[in-house]
């Protein structure tokens, strides 16, 4: 039989940052390959990865055609070498993922704060709007504008000689904080989308960043 | 369901110390913020400090900083109050409540409160 | 640190009244401000977010507004369950500050 000796995949899982998505599964495979196929609820299989000895496919090029579907792969197990016959009708032994809707899913990935400038008693934060894989009229869009008003930056900045945190937050990429004269601040910023329950609710913080180095500008 | 329940309200001499606890259900901690308001009795609401969980950061109002400490361990998913050098001025029911981290976030969720006596 | 002024400290009303109470910030909030309904013994409850937004399964008679750093509560019929004590907030910026509140009390 075609389908002799190979072993179905099994924990097949999801990993997604910022739209980058890839199905991961096991076991990783002794004289077996996989191919994987996606669809949407309502629409037709794709095949992808064909005869892989991976045990990982970047779906990514299909979630971004439209983030708000939810999508469902499976993964079949097919004899090492195997070569695709017209005549063979046996079905090989595959495994559904979970189904997937990147939209509300995918991971926020580390922010990184791109400059803060203070005038007086004001600093203007400005977090770097990530690119993603996701397109309209064939335009990639940045994680602002698949988002819109979902995201929220949490901005924490403290004094450089204490430790309370103090926070702002701001639904678009920018934050203008007041700071007392002569002291020197650091910044750590978090992605969040508030509407969400799950773990994947926050991102990671920013790596900190404090005035008096490159990244700052200070104007009386 | 949402839930946020305090305990360990006491009564206690002043100059001692005491810990309170929120326990939350129905959602996982290091999601969200952590408040701590207290209500003096006949009094308005003053608010103490908040913990992020899923960094530790935190923030306390001039009133309490360097005598009290907000803690979180989510393995519990439970956030602490540990209250040191307590004054009289500190009797108060002690409210914790959640904070979703929108912009608008305002306090949705909040505990029953636990009631501490500073008294001699 | 942020002041909210709150007035009036309490008022006296009946049953159908409209009934005003108002915050003024002491700087800027944008429209992070919320309001809360507090009964005796109980904790606050959420009314009013983000200046002007009812919360989920609060009755339509409370409404929000915003004019600057003027915020306005506005109760359209007092009802009997109404009676209690309102505080504003803002969580513009840390630490976040309340009113003094005003006690809604029955005439």
């Known amino acids: 039989s075609g389908t002799t000796n190979t072993v179905a995949a099994y924990n097949l899982t999801w990993k997604s940052t910022n739209f980058k998505t890839i199905l991961e599964w096991e076991p990783k495979p002794i004289n077996q390959v996989y191919t994987v196929q996606i669809s949407t609820k309502s629409g037709d299989w794709k095949s992808k990865c064909f005869y892989t000895a991976d045990t990982e496919c970047d779906l990514t090029d299909e979630i971004v055609k439209d983030v708000k579907q939810t999508y469902l792969a499976r993964v079949f197990s097919y004899p090492a070498g195997h070569v695709e016959s017209t005549g063979s009708t046996e079905e090989p032994p595959y495994e559904n993922s979970p189904e997937f809707t990147p939209y509300l899913e995918t991971n926020l990935g580390q922010p990184t704060i791109q400059s803060f400038e203070q005038v007086g008693t004001k600093v203007n934060v400005t977090v770097q709007d990530e690119w993603t894989l996701v397109r309209r009229n064939d335009t990639f869009l940045s994680l602002r504008d698949v988002f819109g008003k979902d995201l929220i930056y949490t901005l924490y900045y403290w004094k450089s000689s204490s430790s309370g945190k103090k926070t702002a937050k701001t639904n678009t990429n920018e934050f203008l904080i007041d700071v007392d004269k002569g002291e020197n601040y650091c910044f750590s910023v978090q992605a969040v989308i508030p509407s969400r329950r799950t773990a994947n609710r926050k991102s990671t913080d920013s790596p900190v960043e404090c005035m008096g180095h490159e990244k700052g500008e200070s104007r009386e | 369901e949402v839930q946020l329940v305090e305990s360990g309200g006491d009564l206690v001499r002043p100059g001692g110390s005491l810990r309170l606890s929120c326990a939350a259900s129905?959602?996982?901690?290091?999601?969200?913020?952590i408040h701590w308001v207290r209500q003096a009795p006949g009094k308005g609401l003053e608010w103490v400090g908040y913990?992020?969980?899923?960094?530790?950061?935190?923030y306390y109002a001039d009133s309490v900083k360097g005598r009290f400490t907000i803690s979180a361990d989510t393995s519990k998913n439970t956030a602490y109050l540990q209250m040191n050098s307590l004054r009289a001025e500190d009797t108060a029911v002690y409210y914790c409540?959640?904070?979703?981290?929108?912009?608008?976030?305002?306090?949705?969720?909040w505990g029953q409160g636990t009631l501490v006596t500073v008294s001699s | 640190d942020i002041q909210m002024t709150q007035s009036p400290s309490s008022l006296s009303a009946s049953v159908g009244d409209r009934v005003t109470i108002t915050c003024r910030a002491s700087?800027?909030?944008?429209?992070?401000v919320a309001w809360y309904q507090q009964k005796p013994g109980k904790a606050p409850k959420l009314l009013i977010y983000?200046?002007?937004f009812l919360y989920s399964g609060v009755p339509s008679r409370f409404s929000g507004s915003r004019s600057g750093t003027d915020f306005t509560l506005t109760i359209s019929s007092l009802q009997p369950e109404d009676f209690a004590t309102y505080y504003c907030?803002?969580?513009?910026?840390?630490?976040?500050?309340f009113g003094q509140g005003t006690k809604v009390e029955i005439k």
């Open positions: 907030q803002q969580h513009y910026t840390t630490p976040p500050t």
């Open positions: 129905g959602f996982t901690i290091s999601y969200y913020i």
């Open positions: 983000s200046a002007s």
């Open positions: 700087q800027d909030v944008n429209t992070a």
């Open positions: 913990i992020d969980p899923s960094n530790g950061y935190t």
């Open positions: 409540a959640r904070d979703d981290q929108s912009v608008s976030s305002p306090f949705e969720y």
